[in-house]
């Protein structure tokens, strides 16, 4: 399911429960996706020892995965709500091609991988409603994404395992950073 349990309109409208605010819905959605990533990481970590490797050992890769930096306005120092929100949405849009790549990478967690992908699309929609400056958000080029996807899928098995691990770890870190920032807004 792309939305966490208790998030559909029937549940939200239930008389015993207060409807979630926009911020609460976003917060819950991110936590739901993080739980999904955690399940996917369990499968990848059981298959290889990459999860124990230090970041430096895995740093040499040609993936251009979105990453939070000081200039993005999402950290405690130099925090800027609008700049940060643009970075979060832009980053999530950039991650979409990598989430597509993950779709055929799991045996026992195929549905979980799909749920993470669909939930991220829903999260992007929630955040776009929150953002005032939608013009500042750049959408990735579909042609570039298609060729990147083809290139990633053509890698040998070891590189594909490494890519899967790096995507999950980077996406987890990006979402955790986003959550910390959104909780300050």
């Amino acid at each position: 399911a792309p939305v966490p349990p208790g998030e559909d309109s029937k549940d939200v409208a239930a008389p015993h429960r207060q409807p979630l605010t926009s911020s609460e819905r976003i917060d819950k959605q991110i936590r739901y996706i993080l739980d999904g990533i955690s399940a996917l990481r369990k499968e990848t970590c059981n298959k290889s020892n990459m999860c124990e490797s230090s970041k430096e050992a895995l740093a040499e890769n040609n993936l251009n995965l979105p990453k939070m930096a000081e200039k993005d306005g999402c950290f405690q120092s130099g925090f800027n709500e609008e700049t940060c929100l643009v970075k979060i949405i832009t980053g999530l849009l950039e991650f979409e091609v990598y989430l597509e790549y993950l779709q055929n990478r799991f045996e026992s967690s195929e549905e979980q991988a799909r749920a993470v992908q669909m939930s991220t699309k829903v999260l992007i929609q929630f955040l776009q409603k929150k953002a005032k400056n939608l013009d500042a958000i750049t959408t990735p080029d579909p042609t570039t994404n298609a060729s990147l996807l083809t290139k990633l899928q053509a890698q040998n098995q070891w590189l594909q395992d490494m890519t899967t691990h790096l995507i999950l770890r980077s996406f987890k870190e990006f979402l955790q950073s986003s959550l910390r920032a959104l909780r300050q807004m």
Epitope: R31, L34, S54, K55, K67, E173, L175, Q176, S177, R180
Partner: antibody
């Protein structure tokens, strides 16, 4: 053995500086969030600051502008640079590890602590 | 800024007693609360995280409950090894806060 060991504590004058170290063994520090927590003599625990996987940091209000957390991944060591020290900074300083697998901060591995005394 | 208020600050109890310690957050922190035990001269030890999940190796006489702003740590049958100071800690947000920990509860022998 998986452990954290703090060092660098000692006596320092008010207004002075000190750098504490937290050496990790048995695991790669770069894979974890690491926090500093202090405890003044006879008092409770006080959270000081944290460094996340992306070198993002956050600090308690009392530490902002005076304390800086950094790490040297090649040495598998975390640092707490403390400037403009005051008498109220006197405490045992602990570093602690958060497994960073979830979104909430919780500290499941602690060092033994190092004592910092600020006095003239 | 989130503030954590723990009560009582100290309590006296006997071996075998049921002990309850409460912790209140100044705003909702979901279930993002941990409990620690600390003995004199030692580092704190994680007991419970996510409000109710027992940390590895922690005896089942310890339990945690609560969500939102109100949380409880319960020791079902106090043992000699349990006389210590207990702290709650919010893990919801570590930005713009004075302290992530509650003030502590010292459990003493009656």
């Amino acid at each position: 053995e998986v452990q954290l060991v703090e060092s660098g504590g000692g006596l320092v004058q008010p207004g002075g500086s000190l750098r504490l170290s937290c050496a990790a063994s048995g695991f790669s520090l770069s894979n974890y969030y690491v926090t500093w927590v202090r405890q003044a003599p006879g008092k409770g625990l006080e959270w000081v600051g944290i460094i996340y996987g992306s070198d993002e940091t956050a600090y308690a209000t009392s530490a902002i502008g005076r304390f800086t957390i950094s790490r040297d991944n090649s040495k598998n060591t975390l640092y707490l640079q403390m400037n403009s020290l005051r008498a109220e900074d006197t405490a045992v300083y602990y570093c602690a590890r958060d497994d960073s697998s979830d979104w909430d901060a919780k500290f499941n591995l602690w060092g033994q602590g190092t004592l910092v005394t600020v006095s003239s | 800024a989130i503030q954590m208020t723990q009560s009582p600050s100290s309590l006296s109890a006997s071996v075998g007693d049921r002990v309850t310690i409460t912790c209140q957050a100044s705003q909702s922190i979901n279930n993002e609360l941990s409990w620690y035990q600390q003995k004199p001269g030692k580092a704190p030890k994680l007991l419970i995280y996510r409000a109710s999940t027992l940390a590895s190796g922690v005896p089942s006489r310890f339990s945690g409950s609560g969500s939102g702003t109100d949380f409880t740590l319960t020791i079902s049958s106090l043992q000699p090894d349990d006389f210590a100071t207990y702290y709650c800690q919010q893990g919801y947000s570590l930005r713009n806060i004075d302290n992530a920990f509650g003030g502590g509860t010292k459990v003493e022998i009656k």
